[in-house]
């Protein structure tokens, strides 16, 4: 029969830190040198022995005069309440295969860490606990007099707990949040009645959680060292160091080395010469709470970062072409290095790729002269490629060419006597054209009568215009424009002697809030083209004079321009140009973009006043300049009388009124006479232009009586 | 009863240190925090640092941060805060004060004052 | 410049109830609980509201204390002559990592 093998000499000791028991025993009567498998099993009890809150088993191989040990976390800080512990075994081993009994109980041992000493009245525990954001935690308060009521707070807050015994509550606050670093405070007032007895207070330390780190990458850009970054997260650093910022370690399994990184978002990792070419690396995160790792495998030679070129240059610039010269950090041999241009200039971007060993170049071709380009250059490895390097750029400027394109020019004639005043228009070369920067512009007139002679005027830039006094003869002008480098082509019109066709009628057009369309009847025989020029009507025609080229088969063009103004009349011409480059005038034609209604109303006079009428004038009243084409006039006439007079129709005025409205469909019929009147009666006048916008501004009625019968005026 | 007493009056010229004590009665010293506010003349309360007595632990406001010491020594249960490169805008009366919880840490949690000492005053002028 | 706004004067009559305010931020009253201390010429400031709305021992029931979102007030009813002080809140700082102080409220009982 075999003795059972009670545990003895058990021992309990704890850590308040962690909240923990630590227990250790001996087994008796083991034999000597003998290796046996057993069970024990442990209760814990909480205040009393009878409340037993956590039984459970502990299986282990124990030796001949083997300390066993054993650990158990309390959720309830031990400060809080007296715990007991007892321990039974039982063999559970197939050297004894005959039926096993559990040994006695062990006795209970008692175990209580106090905390609640001196003369206070109220103890708050557990002291200083650092805990992880959504965990669950206990807290207690002992309270020696149990007359006292005690309310606790955190962060301000009542909370509710359940009572353990008389002097001790417990409070279970579940999934607590991060709310500072600096900690989370919790505090017990005991009272009696409405006096404060004392109050005691605990700071809870959350810390938020740990978060694997993200985005771990390991490059090279020399094969000597490898830099590794990652994104950490948040910081679970709290306040006064209870606990610092997560760490991070470097681990690579094949070489078995480990570094700690100094840095919390990336480390560097020296590359051993011995050819190691595959690397496997876990990134640890640690707090005092948790854990966290993540890890990546990879070919050293496929992880090439390379540092960006060097040395960026330009040889060889024309207006044209320039090539790009630059350098790469060598770091292997044989290395082979793909390479990317970027160039910028005009608002384009052309990219290319090219190969290259050690040194790169590339021939920019097709380049806009004058032209300031930037250039930049990033290169990868070609073999493996993984990620660009950063660019490495310069700026440069191509070299001017003569102007390609010659000035669009036009004219305006006037006849005076016995000569004709040419006022000569150029427009600017777009930057396209001009290759550089147009210095002057030479104007070559030639007297096509006499073809010996011609006069140069050289302008310089950037007049736009020039001014030539001619004779009644025919002349050629050729206006050319000109850079460092060279001249454009010659802009050539020709000035006939006779005079432009003066029997042109002027038609009106109607303009659109999209400018104005425009067409006209294709001139008999050849044409090389149109033009129609236009100019405000009334202003001086320097002041914003206009031309537009349009092609020999074409006989209509929209101008629309964001210069046309609503309620401003434009005045456009129409010119076939001929083989031989003289304008004919074929079509005049003005318009408003858009109508507006008059601006003013005519001053009226009132003449030849007798018993029975009297005339209304208005001579003065210009139809030009007015923002709409006048299409006649309304005269407003009020009388005592119920019926209008012959020819006035009955109208209501915007203030609501009633009137008498007669309607004048000429604009430059600017007289009325009212008759059929009553002598010594009050009648009164209003008269107003419109256009197809509508009436001029309304104003006040001008009063008239007529006289009796007897008067003379 | 319970009290916080304060040294005495104190003129220091510009650029000297001054040292303040606060003798605690009444209640354990080491279970509850002590504060440092002081008071120019005419002006509000503006709070310098406090000190844990049973760690000794301390915490200064970002203004008086490498000028301010406080420190304690529990056999006597005295408090003590000195300042260093007094200047004239220093004149003041400074006060320690209690927190109204003992709180069972070896750091800091504001929740009120509740017991104040009769306040030192420190003079700084030339 | 004080972290936490008060006015600077208040004034009641006898019986009148009187509240006195305290603005702040989602930094300092926002977060934290408040206090309210006031303090008669010449002597040491005293606690009257901990917690919000809590008195210490001693301190009549006609103080009373609140707070709404990130600002806190101080109301006293029945107002009496022995009232009038300077009143100042109080609160922890989390930007600051401080206790601040208000401007101070000089309470007139006319």
């Known amino acids: 029969e075999r003795l059972p093998l009670t545990p003895v000499s058990l021992k309990v000791s704890t850590n308040s830190t962690r909240q923990s028991l630590h227990l250790q025993w001996t087994v008796h009567n083991l034999p000597y040198h003998q290796e046996l498998k057993m069970v024990f099993q442990i209760q814990i009890s909480r205040i009393e022995t009878s409340n037993v809150i956590w039984v459970g088993n502990y299986s282990t191989t124990v030796k001949w005069n083997q300390v066993l040990h054993w650990s158990w976390e309390s959720e309830l800080p031990l400060e809080c309440a007296t715990h007991f512990v007892r321990i039974k075994s039982l063999v559970d081993d197939a050297k004894f295969p005959e039926p096993n009994f559990w040994s006695n109980w062990s006795s209970w041992e008692e175990v209580s860490v106090q905390d609640s000493t001196g003369q206070d009245i109220l103890f708050v525990f557990p002291k200083d606990k650092l805990v992880e954001e959504g965990t669950n935690v206990t807290i207690c308060y002992v309270s020696r007099n149990i007359q006292n009521n005690v309310s606790c707070y955190l962060e301000g807050k009542q909370i509710h707990g359940e009572q353990l015994d008389p002097h001790v509550t417990a409070f279970n606050l579940n999934s607590v949040p991060f709310i500072r670093n600096k900690g989370t405070n919790i505090y017990c007032e005991a009272s009696q009645g409405n006096v404060s007895e004392g109050m005691k207070g605990i700071v809870l330390f959350v810390s938020k959680v740990l978060e694997e780190p993200k985005d771990f990458s390991c490059e090279t850009e020399d094969f000597k060292t490898l830099h590794c970054t990652w994104d950490p997260g948040t910081d679970t650093a709290l306040g006064w160091s209870k606990q610092p910022s997560q760490s991070y370690t470097l681990f690579e399994s094949f070489s078995g080395e480990k570094k700690l990184c100094t840095h919390k978002n990336w480390c560097n990792w020296q590359i051993t010469q011995d050819s190691q070419e595959t690397y496997n690396f876990t990134l640890i995160a640690e707090n005092y709470l948790r854990k966290r790792s993540v890890n990546i495998l990879f070919n050293l030679t496929h992880r090439v970062y390379l540092m960006n070129p060097f040395s960026v240059n330009f040889e060889n610039v024309n207006a044209t072409n320039a090539i790009m010269t630059w350098k790469v950090h060598s770091i292997r041999n044989n290395f082979t290095y793909l390479c990317q241009i970027e160039l910028h200039g005009e608002g384009k971007m052309m990219q290319y790729n090219v190969s290259i060993k050690v040194n790169g170049e590339y021939f920019l071709s097709e380049l806009e002269p004058a032209t300031e380009y930037m250039a930049r250059v990033r290169c990868a490895d070609a073999s493996h490629f993984w990620k660009w390097s950063e660019w490495s750029g310069q700026n440069f400027t191509t070299l001017e060419a003569a102007p390609s394109e010659a000035p669009d020019v036009w004219r305006i004639v006037s006849l005076e006597p016995g000569n004709h005043t040419v006022t000569l228009f150029w427009k600017p070369l777009s930057k396209l054209h001009a290759n550089g920067k147009i210095l002057f512009y030479n104007v070559v007139v030639e007297n096509l009568d006499k073809p010996s002679s011609s006069e140069l005027h050289s302008i310089p830039a950037p007049a736009n215009s020039t001014k030539l006094i001619l004779d009644r003869c025919s002349y050629q002008i050729c206006v050319i424009a000109n850079n460092s480098v060279g001249a454009s082509p010659a802009s050539v019109i020709v000035i006939s002697a006779d005079p432009e066709n003066k029997e042109v009628e002027e038609e009106r057009i109607a303009g659109t809030e999209g400018g104005f369309s425009l067409s006209w009847k294709p001139q008999p025989g050849d044409v090389i083209g149109y033009v129609v020029d236009w100019c405000d009507h009334t202003q001086d025609v320097l002041g914003d004079f206009q031309w537009k080229n349009v092609g020999p088969n074409t006989t209509s063009t929209v101008i629309s321009t964001d210069a046309f103004r609503p309620g401003v009349r434009y005045d456009f011409r129409i010119y076939g140009l001929s083989t031989k480059r003289i304008a004919c005038l074929l079509e005049k034609k003005t318009g408003y973009s858009q109508e507006l209604a008059p601006s003013d109303n005519p001053h009226v006079l009132v003449d030849t006043l007798t018993s029975h009428s009297f005339t209304l004038s208005w001579k003065d009243y210009s139809t030009e300049s007015q923002p709409g084409f006048i299409q006649g006039y309304h005269v407003y006439l009020k009388s005592k009388a119920r019926q209008c007079h012959p020819r006035f129709e009955k109208a209501v005025l915007s203030d609501g009124s009633e009137c008498c409205k007669y309607k004048i469909d000429n604009p430059e019929e600017k007289a009325l006479i009212v008759d059929n009147l009553k002598p010594e009666s009050f009648y009164e006048f209003f008269i107003t232009p419109f256009t197809s916008a509508g009436e001029g501004p309304s104003a006040t009625f001008t009063k008239v009586t007529t006289p009796d019968e007897h008067s003379s005026m | 009863q319970v009290q916080l007493v304060q040294s005495g009056a104190e003129v220091k010229k510009p650029g000297a240190s001054v040292k303040v004590s606060c003798k605690a009665s009444?209640?354990?010293?080491?279970?509850?925090?002590i504060n440092w506010v002081r008071q120019a003349t005419g002006q509000g309360l503006e709070w310098m640092g406090w000190?844990?007595?049973?760690?000794?632990?301390?915490g200064y406001a970002q203004k008086f941060q490498g000028r301010v010491t406080m420190t304690r020594d529990t056999s006597i249960s005295t408090a003590y805060m000195e300042m260093s490169s007094l200047r004239s805008e220093d004149t003041a009366v400074y006060y320690c004060?209690?927190?109204?919880?003992?709180?069972?840490?070896?750091?800091?949690?504001?929740?009120?004052?509740?017991?104040w000492g009769q306040g030192t005053t420190v003079t700084v002028s030339s | 410049q004080s972290v936490l706004t008060q006015p600077p004067s208040a004034s009641g009559t006898p019986g009148q109830r009187v509240t006195i305010s305290c603005s702040g931020s989602?930094?300092?009253?926002?977060?934290?609980?408040v206090n309210w201390y006031h303090q008669l010429p010449g002597t040491a400031p005293k606690l009257l509201i901990y917690?919000?709305?809590k008195r210490p021992s001693g301190v009549p029931d006609r103080f009373s204390g609140s707070k709404s979102g990130s600002s806190a007030s101080l109301a006293i009813s029945g107002l009496q002559s022995e009232d009038e002080a300077d009143y100042y809140c109080?609160?922890?700082?989390?930007?600051?990592?401080?206790?601040?102080f208000g401007g101070g409220t000089k309470l007139t009982v006319l």
């Open positions: 004060a209690r927190d109204i919880v003992a709180a069972n840490t070896d750091y800091y949690f504001y929740y009120g004052m509740d017991v």
């Open positions: 009444g209640y354990t010293f080491t279970s509850y925090e």
């Open positions: 000190m844990n007595p049973n760690s000794g632990y301390t």
């Open positions: 989602n930094s300092n009253i926002g977060s934290n609980t």
């Open positions: 917690n919000i709305n």
């Open positions: 109080s609160t922890w700082d989390d930007s600051l990592d401080g206790v601040v």
